[in-house]
């Protein structure tokens, strides 16, 4: 079939693709706030099939300002076109739509983790999903920051097969009555600019000589 | 099985009008956006025109983009093309289809639209 190909792309939206927990999530939001819908359509497009236009059937009449794509978008060599329209009731407000290649345009979330702090070490749990396809690991590398007094250390674990299920990583040779500070993030082989996670703290307990000498006192 | 059945074509001078219907059976036809192609003589299909389901997104190929108007009514299950200005080489077979990808269809008959003096 040989076509020209639609122009879909309209800014009046700003849209975000995301990688949440190993899932695509596109969000968006409106640039004139006045506009205010009562529910979302959100169909999408392929550069190689221009003159299609899916309807993601769980982001149709959509309230949220956001949509779960994993099983959609699977392409990280496709150029995707969302078109976004807004409803008020059964009145159409506006169509809105982006180009998106997955490979430079997603941005990575941290994934969840929880930290436990012993005498002189930490381990770090990073949750990942229990099952992760893999065109969603993108040749993503997990970072984990370790912070104290100042003084910011890079470790990057290797992972084993892919990033799935739960993942514990101790960071060791710690100093015992100690604030360490512990960040998680995915980085992308394309240095793209990374998402980091909030801080979480721990002030490591004393060691056996520390304890020895409050009991001297 | 998605079922369309184009009419309303005919023989019109170049400057006259004509309005194409596409009915449609077998399938939720308010769920899925709808598009027109075409079939000139000799000639590949050709990409017109797409709406998207509620209507509130349409796209037309350069050739006939302020000429044909696409158009639908979902409680009639029916998609439109009203074809103005038409020039001899609007000259074609027009079919209309589901424009998904991941729909399985069969093209239906068509419509012939020819333009002549």
């Known amino acids: 079939i040989s076509y020209d190909s639609p122009d879909y792309t309209d800014e009046s939206c700003t849209f975000k693709i995301s990688l949440r927990n190993f899932r695509s999530i596109l969000s968006w939001e409106l640039k004139n706030h006045s506009i205010v819908p009562t529910h979302y359509t959100l169909l999408y497009t392929i550069m190689s099939k221009p003159e299609d236009l899916k309807v993601v059937k769980n982001c149709a009449n959509t309230t949220r300002s956001f949509c779960d794509l994993t099983d959609e978008w699977r392409s990280t060599h496709e150029a995707y076109v969302t078109v976004l329209e807004g409803f008020s009731g059964n009145t159409t407000l506006f169509s809105c739509s982006h180009n998106f290649w997955l490979a430079i345009d997603m941005s990575f979330e941290p994934p969840e983790f929880e930290i436990v702090g012993f005498t002189n070490h930490i381990n770090v749990m990073v949750k990942f999903p229990s099952i992760v396809e893999e065109e969603l690991q993108f040749d993503l590398s997990l970072v984990i920051e370790e912070q104290s007094e100042g003084i910011v250390k890079k470790h990057k674990p290797e992972i084993k097969g892919n990033m799935s299920g739960n993942f514990t990583y101790i960071i060791d040779k710690l100093i015992p009555n100690t604030n360490y500070c512990v960040s998680v993030y995915l980085e992308h082989s394309d240095e793209q600019a990374v998402i980091k996670s909030p801080l979480k703290c721990t002030l490591l307990p004393p060691g056996q000589e520390s304890e020895s000498a409050e009991s001297a006192k | 099985q998605v079922q369309l059945q184009e009419s309303g074509g005919g023989l019109v001078q170049p400057g006259g009008s004509l309005r194409l219907s596409c009915a449609a059976s077998?399938?939720?036809?308010?769920?899925?956006?709808m598009k027109w192609v075409r079939q000139p003589p000799g000639k590949g299909l050709e990409w017109v025109s797409t709406?998207?389901?509620?209507?509130?997104?349409?796209r037309y190929a350069e050739s006939v983009k302020g000429r044909f108007t696409i158009s639908r009514d979902n409680a009639k299950n029916t998609l439109y093309l009203q074809l103005n200005s038409l020039k001899t080489e609007d000259t074609a077979m027009y079919y209309c289809?589901?424009?998904?990808?991941?729909?399985?269809?069969?093209r239906g008959q068509g419509t012939q639209v020819t333009v002549s003096s």
């Open positions: 077998e399938f939720t036809f308010s769920e899925y956006s």
């Open positions: 709406i998207s389901p509620s209507g509130g997104t349409t």
């Open positions: 289809s589901v424009a998904d990808w991941s729909v399985t269809q069969r």
